[in-house]
């Protein structure tokens, strides 16, 4: 029984489930938005290519004091293989181009829905 105990413990979350949960969280943010999200903070725009999740996290992690996106930041960190800290600047950021957090989240949601439909889960 001790040996079999391992089978009952939860394994890693399948990529499809993780992506679906991230999409659901972004839907919650966009639907429950009353005041300007994160007080209208601006973040770096990103290229939606390989490494997109890390780039998205690197952009959003620079928004401080915004509880609405804290869960999204945590979820994105699960898609990013390396540790991300504030101030990092990826080559996937579009230099000198910032957009509002609300637009960033909305557009990221649009893109992730397309990836999910196409079966691109990570």
């Amino acid at each position: 029984l001790t040996c079999l105990g391992g089978f009952a413990s939860p394994g890693p979350v399948p990529p499809s489930t993780a992506l679906r949960e991230l999409i659901e969280e972004l839907v919650n943010i966009t639907q429950n938005q009353k005041a300007p999200l994160c007080n209208g903070s601006m973040v770096w725009s990103i290229n939606l290519t390989a490494g997109m999740y890390c780039a998205a996290l690197e952009s959003l992690i620079n928004v401080s004091g915004c509880s609405a996106i804290e869960k999204t930041q945590r979820m994105l960190s699960g898609f990013c293989p390396h540790k991300v800290s504030a101030g990092q600047f990826s080559s996937l950021h579009v230099r000198d181009t910032k957009i509002e957090v609300a637009q960033f989240v909305k557009d990221l949601l649009l893109h992730l829905k397309k990836l999910f439909r196409e079966g691109q889960f990570n």
């Epitope: 990103i46 290229n47 939606l48 290519t49 637009q103 960033f104 909305k106 649009l110 893109h111 397309k114």
Partner: nanobody, 118 residues
């Protein structure tokens, strides 16, 4: 906010060519399917062409098929429309727009005028 800025319109003779550009800002351009719509003088809006977010799938109205080519450069946040063998009936204001079914993702440019005349 979101801005779509068209350029490249002008006066051209029948049979000539023009290349329209649409520079996008304030949004994650590569997330969007995009398209071109035109409005001839005194007429309604007419869909011209659209392209998926990756640039791999393109669609054209029968009236421009074989003459117009839509493309995009996601690294430059820019949409293009190459127009060849232009005809008088192509005279119109050409608008760049997002081409998404979902509500809330509808953005349009201000348009650029194309006049085909000798």
């Amino acid at each position: 906010g979101v801005q779509l800025l068209e350029s490249g319109g002008g006066l051209v003779q029948p049979g000539g060519s023009l290349r329209l550009s649409c520079a996008a800002s304030g949004l994650l351009f590569a997330a969007y399917d995009m398209g071109w719509v035109r409005q001839a003088p005194g007429k309604g809006l007419e869909w011209v062409s659209s392209i998926d977010w990756k640039g791999g799938k393109t669609y054209y109205a029968d009236s421009v098929k074989g003459r117009f080519t839509i493309s995009r450069d996601n690294s430059k946040n820019t949409l293009y429309l190459q127009m060849n063998s232009l005809r008088a009936e192509d005279t119109a204001v050409y608008y760049c727009a997002t081409a998404e079914d979902e509500p809330g993702y509808d953005y349009w440019g201000q348009g650029t005028l194309v006049t085909v005349s000798s």
